[in-house]
Structure formats: structure tokens, C-alpha cells
């Protein structure tokens, strides 16, 4: 049976890295579905035996770690009793080249990088970063400039999945890598993220990257309704800001982890001149009173802005 | 300043359940596992797990599996731990204590425990 | 699991000597060049307090005489010049894997 093509992710790579993709189509994926992975062009579904190197793990496909021989395209199949959907993901593996004598000392020399940006004179902060399924467990993240070991300081200051640069000048751009320790079934890996940080002069009263909608405003809507909301953003291009919803401090998907009855969206963009303009929507399937009057939150970067149901007023005309 | 309170002191019956909890301030709760760990009377002391308020996730030490169920309310910044069947060999002190995620490897902050007595 | 084994189980030290305690893992708890040992101080009716991380790490406000050190499966905590407030039950603990583990303890005594 055919399946309707959602998405393809062009993801590149280290080897020897561990590596996850979570494969999510709200609000198909909220329900039950039957959702598989497989490696193209075989009909093999990708094991979920959590002892082997590939393995599914949920709506994840786990590489523990990374070998050049895994490129290739893999497809995310989701079913449930009416319809199919795929998501592709075309995986190139590199060479790794974590400060190698090629590098002149940088980390960053290959496609695998986020590009962030730091407002000069201003505190910013660099994000690791670090989703993998709940059975890897994260820890002891250390932060690079170049290959040398950022240490805390006043300059800067680690803070869990972020590193907090304080006072940014225009020195501070250049090459960083975080890197962290993750332990699977009592096996230790590193992950390594590599990061080229821009430093840019801030318009006054206006942040990088820009929410355009919400803006801290209000929405009315009854109670048991569906809602989506999209976040829209605007960012420069070199720019890779995390972009999410959260409540409460949490991602959403992780705070209605259980009932899944509100859940991010995909996130779509379109390519402007010299900006990139995102949507990532937040889909309430059944609003419910506990949601009235809490701020669910949109985060690019260092911006953020929210919004808060409120119950319809009455119309007593 | 960081606080871990921890509830009062519990007498209960063998056979019965108990539910106790730790009440966190001065830090932002989901950036930090909150774990809990065992101390026997004159004994060392032993990990049983912790609950990430982040994702929700707990891992659990598997001598304890069964025995304890680690929970929190994030609206109260609070953690509990619920202990079923008790007998005379979880007479304890009990500890909450935290972790950074993701960047920490140690407990830095203490709960000053809550002892639990066993006894018919 | 991973076993501490902490050596001697008490000491008695006088005032503004050292106190060396050794902690033995059954096996590495290094990765990556990190050791995952972890010291803490623990006082008659109080929580513990933690001193040294990652082997070898004073933690913030602990005073300098405190020092850790080691690597794979041998670490010391060394306390010089030892002072009254010092007494105390002394634990090493590994976050190498879970389930994390403690040591036994060590009791410092103050001659």
C-alpha cells in the first residue's frame, strides 16, 4: 500500500557519534499508531532489540554510535486505521574530525555544524544540542572554543544544555564544540556538537531571532475544542536557534508525554533574501480547564513570547 | 538559597504504605534529577533512583524496583517517594538530594531526611 | 554493580596532621578522561555534604584542605591540617553508572 510522503530530513553527520531521530507527525502520532522504521530500499523493519548498534527505540531510531556505513535514505512509517504517512531521512556519515592536525585546530570544518549567533554587548548563550529517547541517560557536558576546554568563569558559564556567555564581543565568534557523556544499558558514548558562532551588533529593540506571532497575547477558545496555534519566526540564515513551545520550563512533548493531547508540530520554514522565516505549531486536540490561564510559551533562541487560553466570555446579547 | 524540605518523621505498620516528600526552592526544578537515597541506621548509604522533572523520566535502582515509586507535582517544585509494603528493613533515614542535568555527576544539595520507623 | 571499598574504616588524627582516606572501586570508573568519584562529609543527624567531585574537583565553599585525587580504581581524600569540625563520617560515591554506589564510610576522629 502507498503512503504519503510528509517529509524528507537531510541530516550530515560524524561518525562515531550517537545519533537519534525522532520521528513525530502530530497529530497522527498522538494516537495509537503502528509506527516503523526501515533502512531503504529494504522491507526489513529496523530491529527494536535496544542491544544492537541500530535499533528503534519508540518512535526513535538509535545509532550506537555512528558508522560510515550507515548513509543512506531511512523511511519512518506511520500507520493507523485509516491512513499512511512516511518521513525520510537522508543520512550522510563523515569522516569523523574532532580537532584533527588537518584542522588547524578548529572543530569545525564540515557541514555538521549549528550555526549560532551572539549579541555583541550583550550576555547570550550556545545551545547543546542534546534529544535522545528517555532510556539514554545525559550527562557531564563540557563546552570547547576552538579545541581547548572552556572552564567557568565570568566570561563563561555552563548551565545545563547551555553555555552562558557573558558581555559578548566580537572574539567570542569563531569555532565551539560541546560534547557530553551518554550511558545506553551500562554502555558509555560521546556525543560531540559542533557549533560556528557568529557574533552580530543587535538592533535596538529588536531580538534576532524575531517571533512575529504570538506576542504575549490572549486566544479565546472553548472548552473540549481542537486548537492549533503556529509560532512564527523570523532568523538570519546563518543562524540554527532551537525553536520550540514549552509550559512550565518543559517541551511540550515532554510535559504531555503520557496523554499526548498537546503536542509540537513539525516544523516548516520558508527561504526569504537573507532571512529564513520558520512556523512550528503547538495543537491542543482537547482543551481542557487546567490549560486556561497558563502561558504555553514559543522559544527561538533568546526570544520567547506566549500565549494564554481564556475561557470564552458569554455573549449576553 | 537552595532548600530541599523534607516531610516529617513517619511511624507506620508493617504490611503499610507510606508517602513522603521533598519540597524544592531557590533553583529552577526542572534543570535539576532529583534523587533519593537510603541510610540504615549506623549503614552506609544506597542510591535508590531519581525522577527527571525535565521529561519525566525515572531510573530506578533495581533492588528497589517495586518497593519505591518516585513522582513529582512540577506546579509545587515538589518530589515524592512512595514506599509500599514496608517491613523492619526499610527503617531508614530517607534523603532527597539533586543533580544538574546533563551537566552534573554529583549531588550537591541535600533534603535533611525524613525518617521512617517500622514497627507494629 | 560497582563496589567502594573505603580504607581505614576509622581514624584518629591529631589536630593539624593529616587524614588520608582511600576509596578502591571494583573496577574503572574513568570515561573519557573524567573519573566519576564523587567525596562527601557526613555529621552525626545531618544530611551529606559534598566536598570533592570528579576525584579531584574542591567543591565551591569547601575549604582548601581538602583535597582528592586518584584515577581508574584507586582514589585518597586527603584532609590536612586537620581541624576539630572535621570530625565527621567521610563516603566516597561512584556516578560512573547506576546503580550509583557509596563507599562504607570512614569515621575521622580528632586527637
Known amino acids: 500500500d502507498t503512503c504519503e510522503d510528509i517529509f524528507m530530513h537531510n541530516v550530515i553527520i560524524s561518525e562515531g557519534q550517537p545519533f537519534p531521530f525522532n520521528c513525530t507527525y502530530p497529530p497522527e502520532t498522538n494516537g495509537a499508531v503502528n509506527l516503523t522504521w526501515y533502512k531503504t530500499p529494504s522491507k526489513s523493519p529496523v530491529s527494536n532489540n535496544r542491544h544492537l548498534r541500530v535499533h528503534q527505540d519508540q518512535t526513535w531510531i538509535l545509532f550506537l554510535p555512528l558508522t560510515l556505513e550507515d548513509s543512506g535514505i531511512y523511511q519512518c512509517v506511520i500507520r493507523n486505521a485509516h491512513n499512511c504517512y512516511q518521513i525520510a531521512v537522508n543520512l550522510t556519515v563523515l569522516k569523523n574530525h574532532w580537532c584533527d592536525s588537518s584542522m588547524e585546530g578548529s572543530p569545525v570544518n564540515s557541514p555538521d555544524v549549528y550555526q549560532q549567533i551572539l549579541p555583541i554587548g550583550k550576555s547570550g548563550s550556545l545551545n547543546c544540542h542534546l534529544y535522545f529517547p528517555e532510556s539514554c541517560a545525559l550527562d557531564s557536558i563540557k563546552w570547547y572554543k576552538g579545541c581547548e576546554e572552556i572552564k567557568a568563569g565570568k566570561k563563561y558559564s555552563p548551565s545545563g544544555a547551555k553555555l552562558l556567555v557573558n558581555n559578548v564581543a566580537v572574539e567570542d565568534g569563531g569555532s565551539y564544540a560541546c560534547s557530553a557523556r551518554l550511558t545506553h544499558l551500562g554502555r558509555h558514548f560521546t556525543i560531540r556538537n559542533y557549533i560556528a558562532v557568529n557574533t552580530k551588533e543587535v538592533e535596538y529593540g529588536r531580538r534576532i531571532p524575531n517571533i512575529t506571532y504570538p506576542k504575549n497575547n490572549s486566544i479565546e477558545v472553548p472548552l473540549g475544542s481542537t486548537l492549533i496555534v503556529n509560532c512564527n519566526i523570523t532568523d538570519t540564515k546563518e543562524n540554527t536557534n532551537l525553536r520550540c513551545w514549552r509550559v512550565n520550563n518543559t517541551l511540550v512533548d515532554d510535559y504531555y508525554k503520557d496523554s499526548k493531547r498537546i503536542q509540537e508540530g513539525i516544523e516548516t520554514n520558508v527561504s526569504l533574501r537573507d532571512q529564513i522565516r520558520y512556523t512550528v505549531n503547538i495543537t491542543f486536540l482537547k482543551v481542557k480547564m487546567e490549560d486556561y490561564g497558563r502561558p504555553f510559551t514559543c522559544h527561538a533562541g533568546v526570544s520567547a513570547a506566549y500565549i494564554i487560553l481564556i475561557y470564552p466570555v458569554p455573549d449576553f446579547r | 538559597e537552595v532548600q530541599l524540605q523534607q516531610s516529617g518523621p513517619e511511624l507506620v505498620k508493617p504490611g503499610a504504605s507510606v508517602k513522603m516528600s521533598c519540597k524544592a526552592s531557590?533553583?529552577?526544578?526542572?534543570?535539576?534529577?532529583m534523587h533519593w537515597v537510603k541510610q540504615s541506621h549506623g549503614k552506609s548509604l544506597e542510591w535508590i533512583g531519581f525522577f527527571n522533572p525535565n521529561n519525566g523520566g525515572t531510573r530506578y535502582n533495581q533492588k528497589f524496583k517495586g518497593k519505591a515509586t518516585l513522582t513529582v507535582q512540577k506546579s509545587s517544585s515538589t518530589a515524592y517517594m512512595d514506599l509500599r509494603s514496608l517491613t523492619s528493613e526499610d527503617s531508614a533515614v530517607y534523603y532527597c538530594t539533586r543533580q544538574e542535568i546533563y551537566y552534573s555527576n554529583y549531588f550537591d544539595y541535600w533534603g535533611q531526611g525524613t525518617t521512617l520507623t517500622v514497627s507494629s | 554493580d560497582i563496589v567502594l571499598t573505603q580504607s581505614p574504616a576509622s581514624l584518629a588524627v591529631s589536630l593539624g596532621q593529616r587524614a588520608t582516606i582511600s576509596c578502591k572501586a571494583s573496577q574503572s570508573v574513568d570515561y573519557d578522561g573524567d573519573s566519576y568519584m564523587n567525596w562527601y562529609q557526613q555529621k552525626p543527624g545531618q544530611p551529606p555534604k559534598l566536598l570533592i567531585y570528579?576525584?579531584?574537583n574542591l567543591e565551591s565553599g569547601i575549604p582548601a584542605r581538602f583535597s582528592g585525587s586518584g584515577s581508574g580504581t584507586d582514589f585518597t581524600l586527603n584532609i590536612h591540617p586537620v581541624e576539630e569540625e572535621d570530625a565527621a563520617t567521610y563516603s566516597c560515591q561512584q556516578s560512573y553508572e547506576d546503580p550509583y554506589t557509596f563507599g562504607g564510610g570512614a569515621k575521622l576522629e580528632i586527637k
Open positions: 531557590g533553583y529552577t526544578f526542572t534543570d535539576y534529577n
Open positions: 570528579a576525584a579531584s
